[in-house]
């Protein structure tokens, strides 16, 4: 698809905002070199495209926000892949590098003559992309051109570093916070020995690094740590699963700082290898409460505890989205492809290269069927509003008393826009305050979800707790029907009274064998026996020594009973 023309969604406006959404899945391993993307995505793709288009309509019809200025957009497909996203970001920048002296819309030729070719309006900022690894690559390019970037789900801690990523902001918190939340859950259930898996790439790597650092400080041991790409083949996932079983039955909990598709790969491998129910997966927000992760593999996912960024459904988006139809929705260039994929049917008159669907789409089809709103919809919308409010504040300060774009905003200076964005605060789509700290990050509030079997062959995510500003609240009775059901994930059981822990050479501190102290020794600390001094003996509880009372013989006492060696 590298040679293939990439599709773009346009919406005209006075100011153009760029957006990168994963309209398609990332290329499979064998297609990476061609940059040939996978199947079309609904939640992470089409819904986000429609959210952008409709949110801009709402902003444009709001008389109090950017009056007399129309916001437009150019939406491109990142395919959740760095190479594709970079290629698309270059397209954002190409044709729109207009010097301040240049007359907008006119391009000068090398010989000095003018051309009637209308250049594209410059992109003033970019919304997205979703993946941290991809966002980092895109930021590396955008910051060269002073183009602010607002992410809605890229949560890697690395992106907080403003010396490296100056033009990057996000309406979501850094992963340091959810790593803390995951450690707090592990601590709550006394899991001291866990396996760890992360998605290769920045999100998984930095998140798992934070999880491991925090775990070590809390005395939690990692049995082994593994990494895998989301698009790795079946064999790779199977091998990883087999490696995880080698730590059973001790490490039953697997902490997964993973993208959703990595979790799905693990679930599929569990099915293939017959390992359903052997592990409890503790997943990061890449999994959250996504059905596209668990669909068809619910039995394998049961019991999973996941972290989800707090973001209630946006009702007005559903009101808009569920009315969309392929015959009338022409501004979203991916919509017809999506419709066919969603309903596994063929649209009349739609050019289908391989006509993979035999039946024709029925006119009664509706998106209401099995509709699930993208769990990060609120963040996508908040990111778009952040850009709008940033531009609004910039217009107010640069064009006082002027409605519309004044000369001071032509062209828009990315440095000034960034300054304005960093100071932005407004009430978000769910009623919460949206603001940015000095690193361009937003505060962290998470929901704790549990994937449960609710009835025969009916599975769902239920909210079992929250993590807000360092405080974990969990409904333990909802997660475990009774205390005895709490999964154990420990390497060694506590030692009995009068025993000490002996840690085997090369083992982690959570794995020990219990050894009793000698007859004249007491337990000095959990790793050491100490001999009582002459004339003293260990106490009954073996925590110290008592002096042996000296008994003096008096005249008239019976003779002490003793046996000579000669007595047989």
């Amino acid at each position: 698809q590298s040679s293939e023309r990439r599709v773009v969604a346009h919406m005209p406006g006075d100011i153009i905002i760029g957006a990168l959404f994963s309209v398609h899945h990332q290329p499979t391993v064998d297609k990476v070199h061609e940059r040939k993307c996978g199947a079309v995505r609904e939640q992470y793709g089409i819904q986000r495209v429609e959210a952008m288009l409709h949110t801009l309509e709402r902003i444009n019809s709001d008389p109090t926000l950017l009056p007399n200025i129309t916001l437009g957009c150019e939406i491109r497909d990142s395919c959740w892949h760095s190479a594709v996203a970079l290629e698309q970001s270059i397209e954002f920048i190409r044709d729109s590098l207009i010097s301040s002296e240049e007359e907008e819309g006119l391009v000068r030729c090398v010989d000095g003559s003018s051309s009637s070719f209308r250049s594209k309006k410059p992109i003033v900022g970019v919304i997205g992309p979703g993946s941290s690894s991809v966002a980092i690559q895109v930021q590396n390019l955008l910051q060269l051109f002073n183009i602010p970037q607002i992410a809605y789900s890229a949560t890697s801690m690395d992106l907080s570093d403003k010396t490296l990523f100056k033009y990057f902001m996000r309406v979501v918190p850094s992963d340091a916070q959810q790593a803390r939340a995951m450690v707090d859950i592990v601590k709550r259930y006394n899991w001291t020995y866990v396996s760890a898996v992360h998605t290769e790439g920045n999100y998984g790597e930095s998140g798992m690094e934070a999880f491991k650092d925090m775990s070590a400080k809390e005395g939690i041991c990692i049995a082994h740590s593994y990494k895998i790409y989301s698009n790795a083949g079946e064999q790779s996932f199977d091998k990883l699963l087999k490696k995880l079983t080698s730590h059973l039955p001790k490490a039953r909990v697997v902490a997964c700082f993973c993208e959703g598709m990595t979790v799905r790969g693990l679930l599929m491998a569990m099915r293939r290898l017959g390992l359903a129910g052997e592990f409890l997966l503790l997943g990061s927000d890449g999994w959250a409460d996504r059905y596209d992760v668990t669909d068809g593999y619910q039995r394998e996912a049961v019991g999973g505890i996941t972290i989800k960024l707090q973001s209630p459904d946006v009702k007005w988006f559903d009101d808009y989205y569920l009315k969309l139809r392929p015959e009338t929705n022409h501004r979203n260039p991916w919509f017809q492809e999506f419709w066919q994929h969603r309903f596994q049917c063929r649209l009349e008159g739609f050019p289908q290269e391989n006509s993979k669907y035999n039946k024709t789409c029925d006119s009664s089809l509706t998106l209401k069927t099995h509709h699930v709103q993208d769990s990060k919809m609120g963040f996508v919308i908040n990111a778009i509003y952040s850009m709008a409010y940033g531009l609004h504040n910039m217009q107010m300060s640069l064009c006082p008393g002027y409605a519309g774009l004044c000369d001071a905003m032509k062209p828009i200076d990315g440095r000034k826009l960034l300054e304005s964005l960093m100071k932005t605060n407004f009430t978000g789509v769910s009623g919460d305050m949206i603001l940015f700290d000095e690193n361009g990050d937003s505060p962290g509030r998470y929901e704790i979800m549990n994937f449960k079997e609710m009835g025969k062959d009916y599975f769902d995510y239920i909210n079992v707790g929250s993590w807000d500003n360092g405080e974990l609240k969990m409904d333990d009775d909802e997660v475990w029907s009774k205390k005895s059901n709490i999964i154990r994930s420990v390497c060694s059981e506590p030692c009995e009274k009068g025993q000490i822990k002996v840690i085997r050479k090369g083992e982690v501190s959570c794995c020990w064998t219990c050894t009793p102290c000698k007859e004249n020794e007491y337990v000095f600390d959990e790793y050491t026996c100490k001999a009582c001094q002459l004339g003293s003996w260990p106490t009954d509880d073996l925590t110290g020594c008592d002096l042996i009372p000296v008994q003096y013989l008096r005249w008239g006492d019976p003779e002490p009973d003793y046996k000579d060696d000669d007595d047989k």
């Epitope: 064999q235 199977d238 091998k239 087999k242 079983t245 080698s246 059973l248 039955p249 039953r252 099915r271 293939r272 290898l273 017959g274 390992l275 129910g277 052997e278």
Partner: antibody, heavy 116, light 110 residues
Framework: QSLEESGGRLVTPGGTLTLTCTVS????????MSWVRQAPGKGLEWIGI?????NTWYANWVKGRFTISKTSTTVDLKMTSPTTEDTATYFC?????????????WGQGTLVTVSS | AFHMTQTPASMEVAVGGTVTMKCQAS??????LNWYQQKPGQPPKLLIY???KLASGVPSRFKGSGSGTEFTLTISGVECADAATYYC????????????FGGGTEVVVK
């Protein structure tokens, strides 16, 4: 460490029979256990496995005719409605791991004869 | 469904000779392939695990190799005590399995 199967006998078709594998020196909460059978003059045929967690898996041909369960010192194989085809020596074997890998310890086997 | 195929079903070898038998998995099983030796009236005994690792107490004349779907057991310097039936077993998956064991290869020592 040892395994000993018991309960093998002559049984009529359609009845039920439970074979027991008694373990000694093995922590069944740490190891998976398999049942394997061998008809006279034939090869080894895997019946199923009970993981350390208590989860069970069976060969496709079992189709509910066998059930594996365990206590802290025994692993049982319950046979329902046996046919003459089920005549075999039944072995229990310890897996090297908590799930499924290789069978490193075997019992001597117990003979089940199904005949009317 | 998962199944294992062993070849040949039977073979003859002279004392001191070398014998090679094959085992094929219907799907890739990485190196999760084990070999057992069984003598009449006895339970099977583990020889080789994870394709090439020798079980404790097993002489070094037994050698396992292979990965994926093709595996081989080689016995060099065959002794009379090696007369037995040899079975391969996949240790990869318990899901959708017909039999984890191959059909066996009988080795007759002359």
């Amino acid at each position: 460490q040892s395994l000993e199967e018991s309960g093998g006998r002559l049984v009529t078709p359609g009845g039920t029979l439970t074979l027991t594998c008694t373990v000694s020196g093995i922590d069944l909460s740490s190891y998976a256990m398999s049942w394997v059978r061998q008809a006279p003059g034939k090869g080894l045929e895997w019946i199923g496995i009970i993981y350390a967690s208590g989860n069970t898996w069976y060969a496709n041909w079992v189709k509910g005719r066998f059930t594996i369960s365990k206590t802290s010192t025994t692993v049982d194989l319950k046979m329902t409605s046996p046919t003459t085809e089920d005549t075999a020596t039944y072995f229990c074997a310890r897996d090297s791991s908590a799930t499924f890998n290789y069978l490193d310890l075997w019992g001597q086997g117990t003979l089940v004869t199904v005949s009317s | 469904a998962f199944h294992m195929t062993q070849t040949p079903a039977s073979m003859e070898v002279a004392v001191g000779g070398t014998v090679t038998m094959k085992c094929q998995a219907s799907e890739s099983i990485d190196t999760y392939l084990n070999w057992y030796q069984q003598k009449p009236g006895q339970p099977p005994k583990l020889l080789i695990y994870q394709a090439s690792k020798l079980a404790s107490g097993v002489p070094s004349r037994f050698k396992g190799s292979g990965s994926g779907t093709e595996f081989t057991l080689t016995i060099s310097g065959v002794e009379c005590a090696d007369a037995a039936t040899y079975y391969c077993q996949q240790g990869w998956s318990t899901n959708d399995v017909d039999n984890v064991f191959g059909g066996g290869t009988e080795v007759v020592v002359k």
